[in-house]
């Protein structure tokens, strides 16, 4: 049984060349003719030289799964989903992705280091100490109050509340 | 003795339109493919469309696709290429070639010149 | 699409010589490349089918030669009616049918 060069397909005892991206086989090689292609169908693709008899089915973006569709499917490219705002995908597949989560949200005691993406989770840091953070979205710790000369420190400052201070 | 003979071409505005023909004489003209390959002026050759042996199926490059039509007349051994919405960069000799089997092409007729200019 | 580029661009020779001419695809093809010589205002004419056959009627000082992604075409030597331009076709994946460039073989 022949090897096929790259970019071949083995039919029978034969190699044929493969049809172009966007193009199935329609009819394999022969001694006088060469592989005779025909284009996708619609909602059909193949991304790469192939001998399929077939192009694949485009991918559908499940908006159930927190999808929405960032690139329509082509003859010759696949579906491209993204995450819908606020989420970032879990399970990427080269440019595919198929579920993604919600952007975690940065608890008390720390502030948003870095927002998240359609491809990344949002990066929470701690907050340093003398600031505070009640969590959320918040991209800066707030520093501690400074209770007036007028007033007593009830509580200490922590990573997650301010200084309460009374008047004396 | 094979004779392939196109005909329709001329000048034309751009946006109009124009119908070749290809008459065949000299040899069974309905078992075989037929294509048309053009050549723009002091440049090389470029495939245009093939129809099958049977007419059912027909191929377009992606530069003419939407505004080419190519058809046959078995009864009159007669091949068509109908060019609409046609562009400046459609100027080109048009010639009809007999195809094996969609693939290499033995027979050529002579061209018709298209010129397609306001 | 399979993208065929011939070299040179331009080969001055004198009758008598050999003259090779090559002809890459970009992917493989197969056996399923043709030859065609071109002479000013007149069709292409074919010479070479599948690589390597030459078709009826055309003089045995052709030939051809190669597959998958490299091939030659040969003039074993030149006959004043050999010079033309001369251009490669694939057919192993189709459509679309792509052509070389040309070669242009001039008398030196």
């Known amino acids: 049984q022949p090897s096929c060069r790259q970019e071949e397909f083995l039919v029978g005892d034969e190699c044929c060349p493969m049809c172009n991206p966007g193009y199935h086989v329609k009819q394999v090689c022969s001694e006088h003719t060469g592989t005779v292609c025909a284009p996708c169908p619609p909602q059909t693709y193949t991304a790469h030289a192939n001998g399929l008899s077939k192009c694949l089915p485009c991918g559908v973006c499940d908006p159930d799964m927190g999808l929405l569709t960032w690139q329509e499917c082509s003859s010759w490219k696949d579906t491209v989903c993204r995450c819908i705002p606020g989420y970032f995908c879990e399970n990427q597949d080269g440019s595919h992705c198929s579920t993604c989560l919600q952007h975690t949200t940065c608890p008390p005691g720390q502030r948003v280091e870095k927002r998240g993406t359609h491809d990344q989770d949002t990066v929470c840091a701690d907050c340093l100490t003398g600031t505070f953070s009640l969590g959320g979205t918040q991209e800066e710790c707030l520093p501690w109050t400074n209770c007036s000369a007028f007033q007593q420190e009830v509580r200490r400052g922590t990573n997650s509340t301010d200084t309460t201070c009374s008047s004396q | 003795e094979v004779q392939l003979l196109e005909s329709g071409g001329g000048l034309v505005q751009p946006g109009g339109s124009l119908r070749l023909s290809c008459a065949a004489s000299?040899?069974?003209?309905?078992?075989?493919?037929w294509t048309w390959v053009r050549q723009a002026p002091g440049k090389g050759l470029e495939w245009v469309s093939t129809i099958s042996a049977s007419g059912d199926s027909t191929y377009y490059a992606d530069s003419v696709k939407g505004r080419f039509t190519i058809s046959r007349d078995n009864s009159k051994n007669t091949l068509y290429l109908q060019m609409n919405s046609l562009r400046a960069e459609d100027t080109a000799v048009y010639y009809c070639?007999?195809?094996?089997?969609?693939?290499?092409?033995?027979?050529w007729g002579q061209g018709t010149l298209v010129t397609v200019s306001s | 699409e399979i993208v065929l580029t011939q070299s040179p661009g331009t080969l001055s020779l004198s009758p008598g010589e050999r003259a090779t001419l090559s002809c890459r695809a970009s992917?493989?093809?197969?056996?399923?490349l043709a030859w065609y010589q071109q002479k000013p205002g007149q069709a292409p004419r074919l010479l070479i089918y599948a690589a390597s056959s030459l078709q009826s009627g055309i003089p045995d000082r052709f030939s051809g030669s190669g597959s998958g992604t490299d091939f030659t075409l040969t003039i074993s030597r030149l006959e004043p009616e050999d010079f033309a331009v001369y251009y490669c076709q694939q057919y192993g994946s189709s459509p679309p049918i792509t052509f070389g460039q040309g070669t242009k073989v001039e008398i030196k």
């Open positions: 070639a007999h195809d094996r089997t969609f693939g290499y092409f033995d027979y």
């Open positions: 992917r493989s093809v197969g056996k399923y």
């Open positions: 000299g040899f069974t003209f309905s078992g075989y493919y």
